[in-house]
């Protein structure tokens, strides 16, 4: 599978310093590759813009939680 092996890696080198409203967010994906300098979250907005954010920040964790909760009802 050479295409998969040589697939480009997306990295975040800078994080947004602005809190983004959850109403503007459509999805997220985590960046975990060892080829990247830091772990990150990439949010995709409802207008398909991608924004790098720091997963250690509470608003980022809350936003990820919100996006996940939209698709399933929690027990607690």
């Amino acid at each position: 599978q050479p295409d998969a092996i040589n697939a480009p890696v997306t990295c975040c080198y800078n994080f947004t310093n602005r809190k983004i409203s959850v109403q503007r967010l459509a999805s997220y994906r985590r960046i975990t590759s060892s080829k990247c300098p830091k772990e990150a979250v990439i949010f995709k907005t409802i207008v398909a813009k991608e924004i790098c954010a720091d997963p250690k920040q509470k608003w980022v964790q809350d936003s990820m939680d919100h996006l996940d909760k939209q698709t399933q009802t929690p027990k607690t």
Epitope: Y28, P55, Q61, M64, D65, T71, K75
Partner: nanobody, 124 residues
Framework: EVQLVESGGGLVQAGGSLRLSCAAS????????MGWFRQAPGKEREFVAA????????YYADSVKGRFTISRDNAKNTVYLQMNSLKPEDTAVYSC?????????????????WGQGTQVTVSS
């Protein structure tokens, strides 16, 4: 390099209990939702339970609700699955995984970095 190592499986009689552990390394554990899945011989991988990054929200498959409890200790980089009132149909290999994509907690494609699994066998 991300690693997940499960432990705590074994052979138990129906009605018994087990506590599974999944120790994670190579990532900032406290910022990731985690899930437990299981796979019985000849069957597809099945969602069991999941927990959000802070541990405040938990999610369960209908088949284990009221019997299984998922929890996490972010200081120890470990997620747990307490399994009570075990049934023969709970027999499977249980694996933990890291959730890296938004969406349903019960969907395996949303997860990555699967552990090697731990065997749980429930005899009648």
């Amino acid at each position: 390099e991300v690693q997940l190592v499960e432990s705590g499986g074994g052979l138990v009689q129906a009605g018994g209990s087990l506590r599974l552990s999944c120790a994670a390394s190579g990532l900032t554990f406290s910022t990731y939702p985690m899930g437990w899945f299981r796979q019985a011989p000849g069957k597809e991988r099945e969602f069991v339970a999941a927990i959000n990054s802070g541990g405040s929200s938990t999610y369960y498959a209908d088949s284990v609700k009221g019997r299984f409890t998922i929890s996490r200790d972010n200081a120890k980089n470990t997620v747990y699955l307490q399994m009570n009132s075990l049934k023969p149909e709970d027999t499977a290999v249980y694996s933990c995984a890291v959730k890296i994509y938004s969406g349903s907690y019960s969907s395996p494609p949303g997860y990555n970095y699967w552990g090697q699994g731990t065997q749980v066998t429930v005899s009648s």
